[in-house]
């Protein structure tokens, strides 16, 4: 696993402990919380990042209408169970034996149950809609400039292959970024859209996961883009299974 050799840190994940104990004295980094080795040349999986976060000390209408099956992460933080590859286990349980099924981005997709709850497979989130509202600017952003800047950001900062940024919509002051990645499209080594979206979310919140970086401050043709609000919608390959009681709430 590559890491900055000179001072042995992980450029893509500050929530790690690194030491030169890899093969040939190479720098090796392990995620806090899980102790799993991470590849510092790419993004760390959201599951390992959430686990590390929980272990850390506490300190004309062009816009897309989210589908009726779109999930929003309303449950907040929890200490997840990750598989040996760092992915979310399909079933998550808390210390009081309350269990639920999650999708590949760790968002609950069923009602909560007990230990008898079965989650047969980890359902893939194949479509993510990032909905941003920006603060007033000197003028509306040029759509093509905004599109280019956001695509550049996901390509360069998050190392997400450009083909997975399906669209950038803009209707002042709302910006929507659509990420799409089916199981069949994702090749070995490709960054997962869920991981890229999580890094982006943390950047926007001023909690960058990259080593030695502050929050993400975007500029489009020099114009500061100050984000007022962020909502992220997750669409799974198989619709979620919630009881009617929740759907009508």
């Amino acid at each position: 696993h590559t890491a900055a050799q000179d001072n042995c840190t992980c450029p893509t994940n500050k929530m790690t402990v690194c030491s030169p104990d890899g093969p040939g004295g190479r720098c090796q980094c392990r995620a806090l919380g899980s102790g799993m080795a991470v590849d510092c040349s790419t993004l760390t999986s959201k599951c390992l990042l959430l686990k590390a976060r929980m272990s850390a000390p506490k300190n004309a209408r062009t816009l897309v209408r989210p589908s009726e099956h779109a999930l929003v992460d309303n449950d907040g933080l929890y200490d997840p169970d990750c598989d040996p590859e760092g992915r979310f286990k399909a079933r998550q349980c808390n210390q009081t034996s309350v269990c639920w099924c999650v999708n590949s981005v760790g968002v609950r997709r069923t009602d909560k149950g007990d230990l008898s709850l079965r989650c047969d497979e980890l359902v893939r989130t194949h479509h993510i809609l990032i909905d941003l509202r920006h603060r007033p600017t000197a003028g509306a952003f040029n759509h093509s400039d905004l599109d280019a800047e956001l695509r550049r950001l996901f390509r360069e900062r998050y190392r997400l292959h450009p083909k997975f940024v399906a669209a950038v919509h803009y209707e002042q002051p709302t910006i929507q970024i659509e990420l799409r990645q089916n199981t069949s499209q994702k090749a070995a080594g490709d960054v997962d859209i869920g991981d890229a979206a999580y890094y982006f979310e943390r950047d926007i919140k001023g909690e960058s996961l990259f080593q030695g970086r502050g929050g993400l401050d975007l500029r489009v043709r020099g114009e500061p883009l100050q984000v007022e609000r962020t909502l992220i919608y997750y669409l799974d390959e198989i619709p979620p299974k919630f009881s009617m009681k929740r759907l009508t709430a």
Epitope: R135, T137, A138, G139, I204, K205, G206, E207, S208, R213, G214, G215, D217, R219, R221, G222, E223, P224, Q226, E228
Partner: antibody, heavy 119, light 106 residues
Amino acid sequence: QVQLVQSGAEVKKPGASVKVSCKASGYTFTTYVIHWVKQKPGQGLEWIGYINPNNDGTKYNEKFKGRVTITRDTSASTAYMELSSLRSEDTAVYYCARPHFETHAMDYWGQGTLVTVSS
Amino acid sequence: DIQMTQSPSSLSASVGDRVTITCKASEDIFNRLAWYQQKPGKAPKLLLYGATSLETGVPSRFSGSGSGTDYTLTISSLQPEDFATYYCQQYWNTWTFGQGTKVEIK
């Protein structure tokens, strides 16, 4: 290296106008906005507004709207801040500033221009 | 507008002292906080941005911490050249500065 050089001190009478310039060098002028910041003698800093040299767009602090006009001349890599209907409380040092390359904080500052309003 | 309240407004300290200045925002600014140092007759100088990131060339005795609405600038061991006025600034929603903290020689 990045430099912002401002015009010299001005003494003006109440009711007059003043135009302060800020010449940028060492970077592509249209890449970053130019902010203007006011500092009254012995007091704190107050953001006035900015201009985006790329498209001439401006954004102002509500407090200064109406009396302040920020303009630019891209061929001269210069931004201007004009303040009209001057009064004694406009006596201050006015700074231009450029953002940091990866944040919206202000990294490079001009040396400041003292504007004195006195009858 | 977001208000930034800095405290104390002034403090007296000696060379070698540990100095702490706090800044409170009227709402969550999501770590979009910068700290500046200003000496008499000079323009402000950026010390830290993103609440914790040290600007290039700034000595490591300066550090920042905090989140949400509460932020702190710490000078671990005050040096003679550190006697100055310090300002916090938020850049989450336009730009506003704290009223400043003057660090004087005891």
